[in-house]
């Protein structure tokens, strides 16, 4: 079908719809990725919490913003920042923003365009 | 070596029509999106409209909107950009480019450009 | 009236460095990618700068990209006199559905 795209519902909509949802569970998915099931994440107890559920609680909050492409990168903007300042190293951010960005694929939403995930001023 | 060459700019009179064509060559157009971008006399660079690889997702200048229509064959590699209800406001050179824009996590940006044409409307 | 804001003019002698701002707000630099063009006279418009940082083949290393928070920066070093150019910043603004340039700045190499 061929269509011509009207505006996305503007920044502060969606910026209040981030607020609303709660990002954690993906953040601890992603963690849990990177680190590896076996590793614990000592920001948060997620040892009885396997990776898979994570995942699938992350794509039900996500799930309950409005599907556009400018929100879902908010979303994803929201999580590196949130997390920019527990990851290590160089290698540790580039590894979570993979994750990241594989992020709307595995919960089947679309990937967002124009989405720059370098969100934290160059402390990631 | 890629080769965007614009032509059909002409001198028109307000509330005329004209369409603008780019015959791309060099690279495979079907893989890019491709954008309209203008420039006043004298003035900075204004983008017109983006249009996506397959022509599904088209966007445009507020002020061009409903008199703009931005289209491609992919199969002879051309773009067009139909103006109608054209105004003084519209004059300016028009530039076709190569948006290297992909599907996520990356920005419009302009590899690009054509020599540019030149639309004059007035009467 | 540009969305984006540049200087409208800046100038250093040869072989200086300078720097060229561009502003905006979340709705555009915030969230998206700025990439940054010269015009020579009379010509068209060439990319320098894309994604930020990245540099197209064929652009030496003295043209640089930054981005932080809703304001993007080019830097020049080494100026040399056939860099006296307009150079224009751009990036998508999520609000409006549309790329957005900057106005333009006047590089004028002393």
């Known amino acids: 079908m061929r269509r011509e795209r009207g505006r996305q519902g503007d920044s502060s909509s969606c910026e209040r719809q981030v607020d609303r949802v709660n990002l954690k569970p993906c953040e601890q998915h992603i963690m849990q990725r990177i680190m590896g099931e076996q590793e614990q994440y000592d920001s948060y107890d997620i040892r009885s919490t396997r990776s898979s559920d994570q995942q699938q609680r992350c794509c039900d909050e996500l799930n309950e913003m409005e599907n556009t492409q400018r929100c879902m990168c908010e979303a994803l903007q929201q999580i590196m920042e949130n997390q920019c300042d527990r990851l290590q190293d160089r290698q540790m951010v580039q590894q979570f923003k993979r994750e990241l960005m594989n992020l709307p694929q595995q919960c089947n939403f679309r990937a967002p365009q124009r989405c720059d995930l370098d969100v934290s001023g160059g402390r990631c | 070596e890629v080769q965007l060459v614009e032509s059909g700019g002409a001198l028109v009179q307000p509330g005329g029509s004209l369409r603008l064509s780019c015959a791309a060559s060099g690279f495979k157009f079907s893989t890019f999106y491709m954008t309209w971008i203008r420039q006043a006399p004298g003035k900075g660079l204004e983008w017109v409209a983006n249009?996506?690889?397959?022509?599904?997702?088209?966007d445009y200048l507020d002020s061009v909107r409903g008199r703009f229509n931005i289209s491609r064959d992919n199969a002879k590699s051309v773009l067009y950009l139909q103006m109608n209800t054209l105004s003084a406001d519209d004059t300016g050179v028009y530039y076709c480019t190569r948006n290297g824009l992909q599907d996520s996590y990356s920005g419009d940006f302009f590899d690009h450009w054509g020599q540019g044409i030149l639309v004059t409307v007035s009467s | 009236q540009s969305v984006l804001t540049q200087p409208p003019s800046v100038s250093a002698a040869p072989g200086q460095k300078v720097t060229i701002s561009c502003s905006g707000t979340g709705s555009n630099i915030g969230h998206n990618y700025v990439s940054w063009y010269q015009q020579l006279p009379g010509t068209a418009p060439k990319l320098l700068i894309f994604d930020n940082t990245k540099r197209p083949s064929g652009i030496p290393d003295r043209f640089s990209g930054s981005k932080s928070g809703s304001s993007a920066t080019l830097g020049i070093t080494g100026l040399q006199t056939g860099d006296e150019a307009d150079y224009f910043c751009a990036t998508w603004d999520a609000d409006l559905s549309a790329v957005l340039f900057g106005g333009g700045t006047k590089l004028t190499v002393l």
């Open positions: 249009i996506k690889q397959d022509g599904s997702e088209k």
